[in-house]
Amino acid sequence: MMTGTIETTGNISAEKGGSIILQCHLSSTTAQVTQVNWEQQDQLLAICNADLGWHISPSFKDRVAPGPGLGLTLQSLTVNDTGEYFCIYHTYPDGTYTGRIFLEVLESSVAEHGARFQIP
């Protein structure tokens, strides 16, 4: 019954202090999307409900922005943001589709440049 597929941005990397867009796209199904949940491991980051719109979890309000579309923008990245992110599409009548993105947050280029000045 579940004919759809989730396409994601896959494994991505970004610099510490920067921002990144997490994107998923559901295709190959006629099912209707009623809600998309964004989660990091077991923590709920945000919800986009077809009727009620966006809700960002209070603990992430300062660093998470809704969109573009059903995607999610993470800002002011830290090394602790490295890890798995999941987009969970609730659809009728297919049920739940889940996509996975792995984000690696790298030390910024400023930190890398600093290494050049080390005494040999």
């Epitope: 809600q35 409900n49 009728y92 009548p93």
Partner: antibody, heavy 122, light 106 residues
Framework: EIQLVQSGSELKKPGASVKVSCKAS????????MNWVRQAPGQGLEWMGW????????TNAQGFTGRFVFSLDTSVSTAYLQISSLKAEDTAVYYC???????????????WGQGTMVTVSS | DIQLTQSPSFLSASVGDRVTITCRAS??????LAWYQQKPGKAPKLLIY???TLQSGVPSRFSGSGSGTEFTLTISSLQPEDFATYYC????????FGGGTKLEIK
Amino acid sequence: EIQLVQSGSELKKPGASVKVSCKASGYTFTSYPMNWVRQAPGQGLEWMGWINTNTGNPTNAQGFTGRFVFSLDTSVSTAYLQISSLKAEDTAVYYCARVGGYGGYDYAFDIWGQGTMVTVSS
Amino acid sequence: DIQLTQSPSFLSASVGDRVTITCRASQGISSYLAWYQQKPGKAPKLLIYAASTLQSGVPSRFSGSGSGTEFTLTISSLQPEDFATYYCQQLNSYPTFGGGTKLEIK
């Protein structure tokens, strides 16, 4: 108030067509899938199929293909069921029903129209 | 298609009685089950969804339980307005309804 209001009873001859309307109010029409359910006199409920109110894509249940067409007019928040080449066995009450719930286990038909009686008789 | 079998088909009971209606699925449907009440000449009304969650505005004497293939609807103390026909519905795949249970006054 959230409600679905259906068109009135119809008396049709075999071979004719009928179009039943279901007007939604009190909520965002395009955010909730719409279903159609048939109930023949003295019988149980039969799911006929549904229409994606966001894309307009219809899906018919087995046994309700060909003569049964689901459509929308989102500008007036209305879903339609058209039945062609009517037969005596199409005599039934037809209901539209909204799918409520955010997803997962929460899905259910939370709002129903009052029903439209379609009688097919020569 | 997933088949739902309701039992009993007919049930006679008195005001104040505790009644239980069973719904069995032909294959596992987890908790994707809803219960509806229908009175003559009226549209069905949602009572319970997700097998055990009471719909807003429905009296607490109604309760649902079960998971997998066997589910029950219980009315703890029948009221005069509860005499009606009850249907279960699965939403694990394309929806299907049980055959109904007609609850009559004894």
